[in-house]
Amino acid sequence: HLYPGEVCPGMDIRNNLTRLHELENCSVIEGHLQILLMFKTRPEDFRDLSFPKLIMITDYLLLFRVYGLESLKDLFPNLTVIRGSRLFFNYALVIFEMVHLKELGLYNLMNITRGSVRIEKNNELCYLATIDWSRILDSVEDNYIVLNKDDNEECGDICPGTAKGKTNCPATVINGQFVERCWTHSHCQKVCPTICKSHGCTAEGLCCHSECLGNCSQPDDPTKCVACRNFYLDGRCVETCPPPYYHFQDWRCVNFSFCQDLHHKCKNSRRQGCHQYVIHNNKCIPECPSGYTMNSSNLLCTPCLGPCPKVCHLLEGEKTIDSVTSAQELRGCTVINGSLIINIRGGNNLAAELEANLGLIEEISGYLKIRRSYALVSLSFFRKLRLIRGETLEIGNYSFYALDNQNLRQLWDWSKHNLTITQGKLFFHYNPKLCLSEIHKMEEVSGTKGRQERNDIALKTNGDQASCENELLKFSYIRTSFDKILLRWEPYWPPDFRDLLGFMLFYKEAPYQNVTEFDGQDACGSNSWTVVDIDPPLRSNDPKSQNHPGWLMRGLKPWTQYAIFVKTLVTFSDERRTYGAKSDIIYVQTDATNPSVPLDPISVSNSSSQIILKWKPPSDPNGNITHYLVFWERQAEDSELFELDYCLKGLKLPSRTWSPPFESEDSQKHNQSEYEDSAGECCSCPKTDSQILKELEESSFRKTFEDYLHNVVFVPRKTSSGTGAEDPRPS
């Protein structure tokens, strides 16, 4: 009797009615039920559709734009409980833009355990004022029932018997009104004696067992409930799951092997978003609670030492990151169980996006392969990568593999980054802009020195197109004004002076002195540095009178710190050996100057001898503002003010009393009274600030809800099947 049919997973039924038949044998939907976006359905399509076995939905019920559906009384005649374990934007029942729905008709709905109700923009929907929601859920004040036909007082809601002058349905008091309670013209709302609480009662008004929820077929018997208040086990409702059982999904008891099967099904499946269920404190749960991490071998949650790692298990043991989208799938991961292959050829704002998605990875159990990633300039987006275990290796026993990365110039800033490679070798070939010194530094830091064989690091195809600077350029002269910086640096000439094509000056605003050369750079044009090309100076034969190259940086912001460095631009020599020089990054601040004008000055007189002046600080202070200068001068009076007869009738009263100029302009506008010309008639009172605020909040809340609904509901079609949609799981 208790849950006679099957337990079905959450469903998203859209576009047409074909999938609705999957509900046929469901007693419980473990998850949510969304029925939506059916624009071609007609009332007759729903005539013979009924799912009498459906008793409970564990999450929420959402109906949105289903045309032709006029009532739910035949569709879900026995739906008794919506648990609201996971909610849709705080709601357990959402009826939104159901253009043909005339009544809810859920006449057996007795309990919404958690969450509230949102019924909005249903032009034909009546029988709302006849429902006492306080008998169904606790948080009635959070219900949002607006913009339905019911609002316009156009509904002639008639409860059963009313037409014959009888009152068949129970009446309850809401807001001081004693109203008959019904769902449709033929179905009363069932109201049990208050002593029964939410357990429900029989038709005779006898209370159900305290473990029941909503209804029962016999009083005081936990095996005769229609739904359970706590947990369901072996045909009865129980307060808690006794060992050997585990609590599952907040409503039923399952054994260990059930939980284990769920875990392994997910682990072995390729489906995104499934949960590798774990066991913790008598519960079989989708993931470990915060502060715990999963031990995959025994399904346990073990306490984390420090911040919890997020272990991401890669299907087939490896994952190729070839776009920002594929990087997003690893967002938040701290440990990669498998190997990563980076193959990024292009994209927008890559360095920042990759850091946002891969920047928390601390450990890779397999290997890391960077292959034909033309867009990468640096690997610094792996900001926290500290360990490559090399438990699985690339062919040839490599745990770090870099091949054909045309623009890769830096691995990490080795002065700030530690990386250990437990086992496996390094492989570097065809990375023309990556200097060998950078690779050798990695060997030292990572502990792989001595592991590599002769051809693992190609001497001729790494750094062969780079100016692998081995000399340090020093600035010899720095002068600042409020919008300019003049720089000079020591001259540099390669062995063949004709190889020097010039210098590149890099600069950018840097509020903090923590900038590195490759921050924010990729090879697709994203570069946080401004670059200036500077011709080499004229070469003098006298080494003592060499011209110091330099540049005047113009159009800078006053009182702003800039990070600056300069490097040489040299030709590629025949011997496949390049020279060059580069400066350290220096920080220079421009001078202060006059601030821009103060903003939004307001002046008000509050007496015959005072003027109050208020303003906002300038948008560009251009330095530390220490004080303001206020100038004023007396103006001649307007002659009209003297000539006006102030006793003339018909003059309007002043529209508002003086108030200090500290409110926003909007609130001042709202405070103005609008007096009407028609004498003797009362004017409408202005809205109070709190009313206006409430209206603004409500309008904003409505927009937020609609945005949320559209974001969740409108999803791209699956390319494979062409029907259905992704299964979003809001909470």
Partner: antibody, heavy 116, light 110 residues
Framework: EVQLLESGGGLVQPGGSLRLSCAAS????????MNWVRQAPGKGLEWVAL????????YYADSVKGRFTISRDNSKNTLYLQMNSLRAEDTALYYC?????????WGQGTLVTVSS | QSVLTQPPSASGTPGQRVTISCSGS????????VNWYQQLPGTAPKLLIY???KRPSGVPDRFSGSKSGTSASLAISGLRSEDEADYYC???????????FGGGTKLTVL
């Protein structure tokens, strides 16, 4: 008053049989899993057997499997433990205990002595 | 040999705080909640703590329980002479498919 009262203990020879009963009162007997737990003289507690609400599921400790049978009669609010092929090491004070997630209610115990 | 390991004895003076440990494995404490029982001399055991750290009504708040990983512990603060008893931890073991108890800890109030 909530209580469990065990009976049926006594002296029995090795290989013999004994049937213990546990009468429940003051609570809804059928709403609980029921257990037998024993304690050998001067020793710690040892779980013996468990039965579900309606008797459809039963669990036994390895040490008694195949020799002991747990059963219940919800109409009489009584739990039973049929003990066959008794051994000297089965000598103990036998408690019945009701269970939700823990053993909430305990009886005072009945002593079973297996000796020749 | 008990599946759950407890120290055989513990002691303290009145007013002191004592802690009794209970160590298990992944198949029991690791995935289950732990219960603690008090057995006063010559009486039946009584439930003291259930679900790791919850006290049944009537149990003073001087008794508290906790669990971490595959170990649990019972703490008794403000020790009194009437606390002198045997204390047992227990939980369900999924490998053995049955309840398991610790060997018990005899608490002496000096």
């Amino acid at each position: 008053e909530v209580q469990l009262l065990e009976s049926g203990g006594g002296l029995v020879q090795p290989g013999g049989s004994l049937r213990l009963s546990c009468a429940a009162s003051g609570f809804t007997f059928s709403d609980y899993y029921m257990n037998w737990v024993r304690q050998a003289p001067g020793k710690g507690l040892e779980w013996v057997a468990l039965i579900s609400y309606d008797g459809s599921n039963k669990y036994y400790a390895d040490s008694v499997k195949g020799r002991f049978t747990i059963s219940r009669d919800n109409s009489k609010n009584t739990l039973y433990l049929q003990m066959n092929s008794l051994r000297a090491e089965d000598t103990a004070l036998y408690y019945c205990a009701s269970q939700s997630t823990a053993f909430d209610i305990w009886g005072q115990g009945t002593l079973v002595t297996v000796s020749s | 040999q008990s599946v759950l390991t407890q120290p055989p004895s513990a002691s303290g003076t009145p007013g002191q705080r004592v802690t009794i440990s209970c160590s298990g494995s992944s198949s029991n404490i690791g995935r289950r909640t732990v219960n603690w029982y008090q057995q006063l001399p010559g009486t039946a055991p009584k439930l003291l703590i259930y679900d790791n750290n919850k006290r049944p009504s009537g149990v003073p708040d001087r008794f508290s329980g906790s669990k971490s990983g595959t170990s649990a512990s019972l703490a008794i603060s403000g020790l009194r002479s009437e606390d002198e008893a045997d204390y047992y931890c227990a939980t369900w073991d999924d490998s053995l498919n049955g309840w398991v108890f610790g060997g018990g800890t005899k608490l002496t109030v000096l």
